[in-house]
Amino acid sequence: RKIPKVGHTFFQKPESCPPVPGGSMKLDIGIINENQRVSMSRNIESRSTSPWNYTVTWDPNRYPSEVVQAQCRNLGCINAQGKEDISMNSVPIQQETLVVRRKHQGCSVSFQLEKVLVTVGCTCVTPVIHHVQ
Amino acid sequence: RKIPKVGHTFFQKPESCPPVPGGSMKLDIGIINENQRVSMSRNIESRSTSPWNYTVTWDPNRYPSEVVQAQCRNLGCINAQGKEDISMNSVPIQQETLVVRRKHQGCSVSFQLEKVLVTVGCTCVTPVIHHVQ
């Protein structure tokens, strides 16, 4: 799902207030609900009829440093016999997410939000058009 | 996939530098890759064998203000005949994402990161346990 443009209003102070100096804002340390955890059913990536693999990307100047991307294993879907059925399609499910980018020059450290597209998993769909009969 | 704990290091200055004043950091205005957009196959939520609906939650003091949650429509999966097959299970795919929480007292505005669990869609899996024969 998509994140709308900031529209330069969310991060602004009310009009009656002096503007933010130097184009930056105050970001409080700590993360709300930091201990909240994804709870997904076990091994769904291999049990799915549209199975996927995970690839981890790592960047020490990004929070979270680890971003996991899914890739669908098949073009078709896996049928009850464990064979690929190309009359159905495995398709990725994508999500826009925010990460924080760290920028430093000596002791001057600043942060900036960055939008990242993450493929979270795959789902099996009936095709819109049949390339293959 | 899960976001690891901050571990109080990512947002800190190097040890040789003076500490961050008042427990806050500088967040630059603007979002890197703001124009990047999800490109997903059309209507996958209704074409999936594990279809889902979307619910929108709205909070003006959160960025993005709109967070979309998916809910699987069925317990089983939809077969080639368009009927629900309860020998297979529709399960949610979750993702941890970051949002920004805005806090203001008069002209003093600060921001804080918040972790949110988002259900992005659903996938059809072979069951771990057979509740139903």
Epitope: - | N74, L75, P127
Partner: nanobody
Framework: QVQLVESGGGLVQAGGSLNLSCVIS????????MGWFRQASGKEREFVAA????????VYADSVKGRFTMSRDNAKNTVYLQMNSLKPEDTAVYYC????????????????WGQGTLVTVSS
């Protein structure tokens, strides 16, 4: 913490009926299914029935199929279990719970249960 309140249990003769209800205080945004479970004295808790909040489709354990009917009222965050043709072996404490992974949910996935409602079927 989500709260679950089950009610409607009681003592009934074999062949009789009862209608259980369960109110969930707060549905998670992604929560899509609810289940009924039961635990007879000295036995493990077992699955009875499940329903999808959106689709409304219900599934049943073989032992209750054709006798029990699960339904839901989305506006009231309530699910029901209509139990007909009750048998002595249906005697148990009945619990409801959110099923975060639908039919993929296992007993290990729960860390919280309500107080349940006792159903006793006499012969």
């Amino acid at each position: 913490q989500v709260q679950l309140v089950e009610s409607g249990g009681g003592l009934v003769q074999a062949g009789g009926s009862l209608n259980l209800s369960c109110v969930i205080s707060r549905r998670t945004p992604s929560g899509y299914a609810m289940g009924w479970f039961r635990q007879a004295s000295g036995k493990e808790r077992e699955f009875v029935a499940a329903i999808s909040w959106i689709g409304g489709g219900a599934v049943y354990a073989d032992s209750v199929k054709g006798r029990f009917t699960m339904s839901r009222d989305n506006a009231k965050n309530t699910v029901y279990l209509q139990m007909n043709s009750l048998k002595p072996e249906d005697t148990a404490v009945y619990y409801c719970n959110d099923m975060p992974y639908g039919l993929d949910t296992t007993m290990d996935d729960y860390d919280y249960w309500g107080q349940g409602t006792l159903v006793t079927v006499s012969s």
